[in-house]
């Protein structure tokens, strides 16, 4: 589904402005905040979504142990700089000239510095661990059923190829979804695991980015799967560079 022709909307991103001013009067959608044209047949990049969010009105042990290099997004929201493809620029700075380096999902991976800070390349996040706790149910979910339904969700709703869902772990009430995608594995047209994880995170929070779709209603053999806590860990192809001061 590209931009819907009938009422000219973007099915995959409600944070857009759409108008029939594309070639041949076709519906064309642009992201809020950046004004960049977006492809409504796939997920919009996290960078453009964050930028749009910042521009919007402000009212509204089978389990994996994250490695020592895993990053959690503790800094929260910021207004990012995106490149012409909609990816995060490796260096981000705020209005007070404080700068830092980010990975491909926009999470800070260095100490903060000044305008002299250099970020040589955008380091790819190749492994994302989504850690969920579900609300109590009559009994534990069947692990195989849970695996099947979460894979279906990422495949159907976020269009993420199944090969990038590396594993689904379950120890009631904790569910862990591992997404893996190396630079060499990602082909043109493949959804990025960082974008899929961000859409999932927003769905879980009841802040769906999809146009006109209901919120996430996930059921396993008819039993609702309701998430009460989410933590997302990001692992980069190159470990982050923080000073020892931050680690104490």
């Amino acid at each position: 589904h590209t931009a819907a022709q009938d009422n000219c909307t973007c099915p995959t991103n409600k944070m857009t402005v759409c108008s029939p001013d594309g070639p041949g009067g076709r519906c064309q959608c642009r992201a809020l905040g950046s004004g960049m044209a977006v492809d409504c047949s796939t997920l919009t990049s996290k960078c453009l979504l964050l930028k749009a969010r910042m521009s919007a009105p402000k009212n509204a042990r089978t389990l994996v142990r994250p490695s020592e290099h895993a990053l959690v997004d503790n800094d929260g929201l910021y207004d990012p700089d995106c490149d012409p493809e909609g990816r995060f620029k490796a260096r981000q700075c705020n209005q007070t000239s404080v700068c830092w380096c980010v990975n491909s999902v926009g999470v800070r991976r260095t100490d903060k510095g000044d305008l002299s800070l250099r970020c040589d390349e955008l380091v790819r996040t190749h492994h994302i661990l989504i850690d969920l706790r579900h609300r109590p149910t009559a009994g534990a979910f069947n692990h195989s059923d849970l695996d099947a339904e979460l894979r279906r969700l990422f495949r159907e709703r976020y269009r993420l190829h199944p090969k990038f869902v590396a594993a689904v772990h379950y120890e009631q009430p904790t569910i862990q979804i591992e997404l893996r995608q190396n630079t060499s594995q990602k082909a043109a047209g493949d959804v990025d695991i960082g974008d899929a994880a961000y859409y999932f995170e927003r769905d879980i929070k009841g802040e769906s980015l999809f146009q006109g779709r209901g919120g996430l209603d996930l059921r396993v053999r008819g039993e609702p799967l309701q998430v009460e806590r989410t933590l997302i860990y990001y692992l980069d192809e190159i470990p982050p560079k923080f000073s020892m001061k931050r680690l104490t």
Epitope: H143, S144, D145, D147, A148, E149, R151, R152, R155, E156, R157, H161, P162, K163, V165, A166, A167, V168, R213, G214, D217, R219, V220, R221, G222, E223
Partner: antibody, heavy 117, light 111 residues
Framework: QVQLQESGPGLVKPSQTLKLTCTVS?????????WNWIRQPPGKGLEWIGY???????LYNPSLKSRVTISRDTSKNQFSLKLSSVTAADTAVYYC??????????WGQGTLVTVSS | DIQMTQSPSSLSASVGDRVTITCRAS??????????LHWYQQKPGKAPKLLIY???NLESGVPSRFSGSGSGTDFTLTISSLQPEDFATYYC?????????FGQGTKLEIK
Amino acid sequence: QVQLQESGPGLVKPSQTLKLTCTVSGYSISSGYYWNWIRQPPGKGLEWIGYISYSGRNLYNPSLKSRVTISRDTSKNQFSLKLSSVTAADTAVYYCARDTTAYFDYWGQGTLVTVSS
Amino acid sequence: DIQMTQSPSSLSASVGDRVTITCRASESVSSSVNRFLHWYQQKPGKAPKLLIYRASNLESGVPSRFSGSGSGTDFTLTISSLQPEDFATYYCQQSNEDPYTFGQGTKLEIK
């Protein structure tokens, strides 16, 4: 016991729209699972057409996507298939089936649809 | 799309024989905890009937002479001792990726 039953015209003219309905008993289609259409041309194999989920989400086979619509009427516990611009190649037995966790555990008995003028 | 290839396309056997049908996927249909490969039996004029789900799980009510095995791309359906009612066409189906796809079928006939 879950039961599915297909209904609709057995003969459709070329270029017209094929419309079939599947009536489900023994389970509410909005309570869970995925509700599918599958077809089988005479003497040939099975082809998945698409589904509508318990929450109303659709997924279609890309080979048919431009011509297919699957919808539902929860008040009647029915889901329907519309296939537009049919040709003789769409002649087949059409089955509705329930997808539990990505396999089909309950099937309708099937209905033969012939496309002919 | 994932292509599913069954072999043989047809086979003749006698009551009491042990029969094996194979199904090969063009790419892996397994996850870390699941094998998204299922087997169905179809008799003339009837709807397919689920026999085995997720490669090796016997559907409720299906006789124990049916069994399934395999992972990744190669899977097998075995009937340990053929009964007269087992003569039918058998299909494998993958659900790892959409579109879901079926094998072309294996017709099991009486020798």
